[in-house]
């Protein structure tokens, strides 16, 4: 599986901020089915796209947490968004609709970085960061920031601080973080590759 | 399909700049990365660098940096390099390549343009 | 910047023999490696990715194969139309880089 964890972080995180505002307000009312919790207001209003895709799927699963996110953003007029994350889904069970042939599994979504295709997946698992901090350091990742995810106590959460810094990054920088892993922990891409 | 089609060949003098066009069709140029290599004469390929269209960034080979320019229109979903100060050593077949794959690990080139030969002579 | 090593520069065999072409990387490039053919005045076309992928409609006599800084391309039982130069190109690190080439020409 996570496959629909990763189309539903996708989703999110290709939201504004004030769509994913929206989002969030909307999941407080969304009906649920029966047997479902609704997660608790003040968690929710806190979390980035990432912490809600762990909440969504802890809560209701991966595939009903997909259908969830898809209901949401088509209650939100955002149509095209929920077909895409229902389609990624079908694809990862197997399943395509009647007369539509699924895609590859290496039809990624196009235009979207390697890292930003895999970001929940490297966030835990990448465990040489303090190796793609100094790979970094100077041409991507500025003092500050070096020291900032440095002072984050665990992998996840330095791999967690790394990432808030990439929507700045242009296709490049995003590269040479992608070398620095290939380099440092090639079989964790070779895995994701065929993820 | 996937067509990537450059502009015809350049004869140039030494030191003047060209600048040479690779057109692409049948996917969207935004969401991939373009590729430039030469070839000189009886010499192997060489890797001279890439731009992204979709934000603009490009990656170098130092070897080349401030010879090439690399410059991407996504009116006209063309790529584009210059080609600076001009020497006999600039001579060559220089190729537009599409990777198999933009958001996979590496970068295979499975889409070529046909070339264009560049010849810097007095 | 990562050295590609191809050997041999040139090589001659016979029809329906099975050739062998080695590359080796100065350092250790994993399996992030693929092999090009290139015919006279034609294209450079992409054969293998990641070592041992055959690329889309090349036939299943091209193999190949190696990991982190020894690799081969092998072709069995050797067609006419598969003269022309071999180049193997890391993708590893940046600057990508190619192999020297190997130009295979029929006995």
């Known amino acids: 599986m996570g496959r629909a964890r990763d189309a539903i972080l996708d989703a999110l995180e290709n939201l504004t901020a004030e769509e994913l505002k929206k989002f969030k307000l909307k999941l407080l009312s969304v009906p649920l089915r029966e047997g479902y919790g609704r997660i608790p207001r003040g968690a929710l209003l806190s979390m980035d796209a990432l912490d809600l895709t762990d909440k969504l799927v802890s809560f209701y699963l991966e595939t009903y947490g997909a259908e969830l996110t898809a209901n949401v953003l088509r209650d939100m007029g955002l149509q095209e968004m929920a077909g895409q994350l229902q389609a990624a889904t079908h694809q990862g069970s197997g399943a395509a609709p009647a007369g539509i042939q699924a895609p590859p599994q290496s039809a990624a979504k196009p235009g979207l970085h390697f890292i930003d295709q895999h970001r929940a997946a490297l966030i835990a698992r990448v465990t040489n960061v303090e190796w793609l901090l100094d790979a970094l350091y100077g041409k991507v990742l500025t003092d500050e920031q070096y020291q900032a995810v440095r002072a984050e106590p665990t992998n996840p959460s330095k791999m967690r601080k790394l990432f808030s810094f990439t929507p700045a990054w242009n296709w490049t920088c995003k590269d040479l973080l992608l070398q620095a892993l290939r380099e440092s922990q090639s079989y964790l891409v070779e895995d994701l590759e065929r993820s | 399909q996937v067509q990537l089609q450059q502009s015809d060949a350049e004869l140039v003098k030494p030191g003047a700049s060209v600048k040479i066009s690779c057109k692409i069709s049948?996917?969207?140029?935004?969401?991939?990365?373009i590729h430039w290599m030469n070839q000189r004469p009886e010499q192997g390929l060489e890797w001279i660098g890439y731009i992204y269209p979709g934000d603009g960034s490009a990656m170098y080979n130092e070897k080349f940096r401030g010879k090439a320019t690399l410059t991407a229109d996504k009116s006209s979903s063309t790529a584009y390099m210059q080609l600076n100060s001009l020497t006999s050593e600039d001579s060559a077949v220089y190729f537009c390549a599409r990777p198999l794959y933009s958001y996979a690990s590496y970068y295979w080139f499975a889409y070529w343009g046909q070339g264009t030969l560049v010849t810097v002579s007095a | 910047d990562i050295q590609m090593n191809q050997s041999p520069s040139s090589l001659s065999a016979s029809l329906g023999d099975t050739i062998t072409i080695t590359c080796h990387a100065s350092q250790n490039i994993n399996v992030w490696l693929s092999w090009y053919q290139r015919k006279p005045g034609n294209i450079p076309k992409l054969l293998i990715y990641?070592?041992?992928n055959l690329h889309t409609g090349v036939p299943s006599r091209f193999s190949g194969s190696g990991s982190g800084t020894g690799f081969t391309l092998t072709i069995s039982s050797l067609q006419p139309e598969d003269i022309a130069t071999y180049y193997c190109q890391q993708g590893q690190s940046y600057p990508l880089t190619f192999g020297g080439g190997t130009k295979l020409e029929i006995k």
């Open positions: 990641k070592s041992s």
């Open positions: 049948g996917y969207t140029f935004t969401d991939q990365t």
